[in-house]
């Protein structure tokens, strides 16, 4: 998924169904948020780069008992080639920065949207 939907090739290619569903789930979370997401839980910020799916999962998996992001956690696990468990961290984490889950989800969504617009919006 480093190519992310095929933008390395000429002309834009829409995302796979799985990635489309992940984006839609992130949209649902950000748009339907009423009370503080996951009771305002904090997670490690990540570098939104090539291995971001695993890094995102490693960060979010440390949030337990939050049904609002369970589907996102499951979806991210489908994009990560290795098994991720709580307390596991990669070099992609910005270990000195913690942010609220709501902000984490919003940042991830914005980054995915930017990636898909690359190569078509000049």
């Amino acid at each position: 998924l480093t190519c992310l939907g095929g933008f390395a090739s000429p002309g834009p290619v829409p995302p796979s169904t799985a990635l489309r569903e992940l984006i839609e789930e992130l949209v649902n979370i950000t748009q339907n948020q009423k009370a503080p997401l996951c009771n305002g839980s904090m997670v490690w910020s990540i570098n939104l780069t090539a291995g971001m799916y695993c890094a995102a999962l490693e960060s979010l998996i440390n949030v337990s008992g939050c049904s609002a992001i369970e589907k996102t956690q499951r979806m991210l696990s489908g994009f990560c080639p290795h098994k991720v468990s709580a307390g596991q961290f990669s070099s992609l984490h910005v270990r000195d920065t913690k942010i609220e889950v709501a902000q984490f989800v919003k940042d991830l969504l914005l980054h995915l949207k930017k990636l898909f617009r690359e190569g078509q919006f000049n």
């Epitope: 002309g11 984006i23 898909f116 617009r117 078509q120 919006f121 000049n122």
Partner: antibody, heavy 119, light 107 residues
């Protein structure tokens, strides 16, 4: 509720330019692309192009490249479409519409702006 | 550029009848196909997205099917307010393109 409100009808002479506005409300403006679609009298719908309000990045239909410019003003949540060197066959209703990402559907539309090009 | 061909151009039916509208893409667009309804003097209205996904507020009599290059919009039982023009739209790649439309008129 989501609303896209467009500017009023315009009558222009051939060779002139027109600038149509589209004011968005009821959602976070930078979260959605704004696309422009036109419809000549009695004809079908034609996609003109799009703008990402967050970055100002644009994508234009080749047919209109060089004649069209799409811009946004995020402070007022307004999108603009300027079409230059107008011809009689540019007479049409111009619609703005929003899309979350280009492959999504156009879920909300403006009411349309009739642009008449006549000498 | 992906070309969408809608057929028939005009469909003459009576209220209560079933309407079947076709949209054919010039290349594989998976399920990135959306349907809109347009009534005279009005902006188009989204009916179906991703070929078969329904929209809240749209009556259940509207349904979509298909994938790849062949798509269908079905209106199970026509109501008087359904007589309008229907357009399909390619959401697969730029330039976004729309079919020429199918006019559903009262017989």
């Amino acid at each position: 509720q989501v609303q896209l409100v467009q500017s009023g009808a315009e009558v222009k002479k051939p060779g002139a330019s027109v600038k149509v506005s589209c004011k968005a409300s009821g959602y976070t403006f930078i979260d959605y692309e704004i696309h422009w679609v036109r419809q000549a009298p009695g004809q079908g719908l034609e996609w003109m192009g799009a703008i990402d309000p967050e970055t100002g990045g644009t994508a234009y239909n080749q047919k209109f490249k060089g004649r069209v410019t799409m811009t946004t003003d995020t402070s007022t949540s307004t999108a603009y479409m300027e079409l230059r060197s107008l011809r009689s066959d540019d007479t049409a209703v111009y619609y703005c519409t929003r899309i979350l990402l280009y492959y999504y559907p156009m879920d909300y539309w403006g009411q349309g702006t009739l642009v008449t090009v006549s000498s | 550029e992906i070309v969408l061909t809608q057929s028939p151009a005009t469909l003459s039916l009576s209220p209560g009848e079933r309407a079947t509208l076709s949209c054919r893409a010039s290349q594989n667009i998976s399920d990135y196909l959306h349907w809109y309804q347009q009534k005279p003097g009005q902006a188009p209205r989204l009916l179906i997205y991703y070929a078969s996904q329904s929209i809240s507020g749209i009556p259940a009599r509207f349904s979509g099917s298909g994938s790849g290059t062949d798509f269908t919009l079905t209106i199970s039982s026509l109501e008087p307010e359904d007589f309008a023009v229907y357009y399909c739209q390619n959401g697969h790649s730029f330039p976004l393109t729309l079919g020429g439309g199918t006019k559903v008129e009262i017989k």
